[in-house]
């Protein structure tokens, strides 16, 4: 059973003896509380009681899962990859039935020679990982294969992989134009039919840190954003300090609500602070403003 709990008031005392009085829950949003047995576990926002404490769901934390974190862990993959589906026609090998069987000695030998040839062709491409033959068919030998590319994740990974796929196209076009049969003989490791070279399809790893950030932020998706530090993406709310998007609350504390980040201003023995960024100080005795 779920219960809606009344809003309580939280008082925060700062190191200078100041206090902040603010409703701890956004009044406009009913908060659900998980109840286990007869005992109210007070785990809000979908959190559950594990017998000792509340286990909170992202993006919540706190004793009762009532607070919103300032940053959410997002983990981009270490490496990203692309797969190119290519077809080339090898003219220096005649097709035989044994090549249809991937476990035959003939297939294994063809695979080895073809791999060696392609490793030579793509040797200058740092993203190149290898080739994988998917099918061999008559004509002399039509080789359907995948070219595999991989690179470290950076914000520009798509550009890096797109560039690598372009170089693959250039190199395979070059080799299949140059290594051709003369007088029914081939002087290269393999010879090709220039017109048989086709790129069928290119698949690139899809990873969008912004999308992951928005998904994990759930109902706060509009207020969390991605900023990069040392090529690594961080999913942060404006309440996280040290980023371009960080909110400066001056004499106050940043708190997330479903309407975004807001500053909760402090009251000290001598001043009370107001304004959107808690930058307007009013002296209690003299009623004098400092900006």
């Amino acid at each position: 059973p779920l219960a809606t709990i009344p809003v309580s008031t939280t008082s925060l005392t700062s190191s200078e003896g100041s206090t902040i009085s603010t409703p701890s829950v956004d009044i406009s949003t009913p908060v659900t509380t998980s109840i286990v047995g007869d005992q109210c576990s007070r785990c809000k926002n979908g959190g559950f009681w594990d017998g000792l404490k509340c286990q909170c769901l992202t993006p919540y934390y706190g004793e009762s899962c009532e607070e919103v974190v300032n940053s959410i862990d997002i983990a981009p993959p270490e490496t990203v990859s692309a797969q190119m589906e290519l077809t080339v026609t090898v003219t220096s090998v005649k097709f035989t039935d044994e090549l249809k069987n991937h476990s035959s000695q003939e297939f294994r030998e063809f695979n080895k020679t073809f791999t060696e040839q392609m490793n030579i062709v793509y040797s200058g491409i740092p993203e190149y990982v290898g080739v994988n033959i998917t099918n061999l068919r008559l004509g002399s030998v039509v080789v359907e294969h995948d070219v595999l590319l991989r690179t470290k994740y950076t914000p520009e990974y798509k550009t890096a992989l797109d560039n690598a796929t372009e170089v693959v196209k250039q190199k395979i076009t070059k080799v299949t134009t140059e290594q051709i049969m003369t007088n029914d003989n081939c002087s290269a490791l393999m010879c090709f039919n220039t017109t048989g070279t086709q790129v069928q399809n290119i698949t690139v790893t899809q990873y969008d840190p912004v999308e992951e950030c928005r998904q994990k932020a759930e109902e706060y998706e509009d207020y969390f954003l991605v900023e990069y530090r040392d090529q690594k993406p961080y999913c942060i709310s404006p309440c996280e300090s040290g980023f371009n998007a960080s909110k400066n609350c001056n004499h106050g504390k940043c708190q997330m609500s479903q309407n975004g980040a807001r500053c909760l201003c402090v009251t000290t023995e001598t001043h009370w602070y107001s304004g959107e960024d808690c930058n307007q100080g009013t002296q209690k005795s003299h009623h004098h403003h400092h900006h």
């Epitope: 090998v93 005649k94 035989t96 044994e98 030998e109 020679t113 029914d184 003989n185 010879c191």
Partner: nanobody, 123 residues
Framework: DVQLVESGGGLVQPGGSLRLSCAAS????????MAWFRQAPGKEREGVAF???????SYAESVKGRFTISRDNALSSLYLQMNSLRAEDTAVYYC?????????????????WGQGTMVTVSS
């Protein structure tokens, strides 16, 4: 395991003849491609003669009309009949094989090799 063993090399006078043999064990003799390569001192290995499973043959320009390649599938053997030998034919002759029907003279395309037999043409 494929094993190729050459024999028949030796010293011969210019204009003379020699017949090289290559015994192939563990190799399906009715399939693929068999070839003779040679390597003269200080030179690269070069293709001399080639024969496919269907009997198709091809020769290096320098030996055309003088050398003849043949294979005996029943005996799993490859032969090279060399006539009108010249001093420039002096080299180590290697038997090579591939399970594939190849039309390439590139040595790197052939995975199986013998140890070689020396042919010296000298007066």
């Amino acid at each position: 395991d494929v094993q190729l063993v050459e024999s028949g090399g030796g010293l011969v006078q210019p204009g003379g003849s020699l017949r090289l043999s290559c015994a192939a064990s563990g190799f399906p003799s009715s399939r693929g491609t068999m070839a003779w390569f040679r390597q003269a001192p200080g030179k690269e290995r070069e293709g001399v003669a080639f024969i496919n499973s269907d009997g198709r043959t091809s020769y290096a320009e320098s030996v055309k009309g003088r050398f003849t390649i043949s294979r005996d599938n029943a005996l799993s053997s490859l032969y090279l009949q060399m006539n009108s030998l010249r001093a420039e034919d002096t080299a180590v002759y290697y038997c090579a094989a591939s399970l594939l029907y190849l039309m390439t003279v590139n040595a790197a395309a052939y995975p199986y090799w013998g140890q070689g037999t020396m042919v010296t043409v000298s007066s």
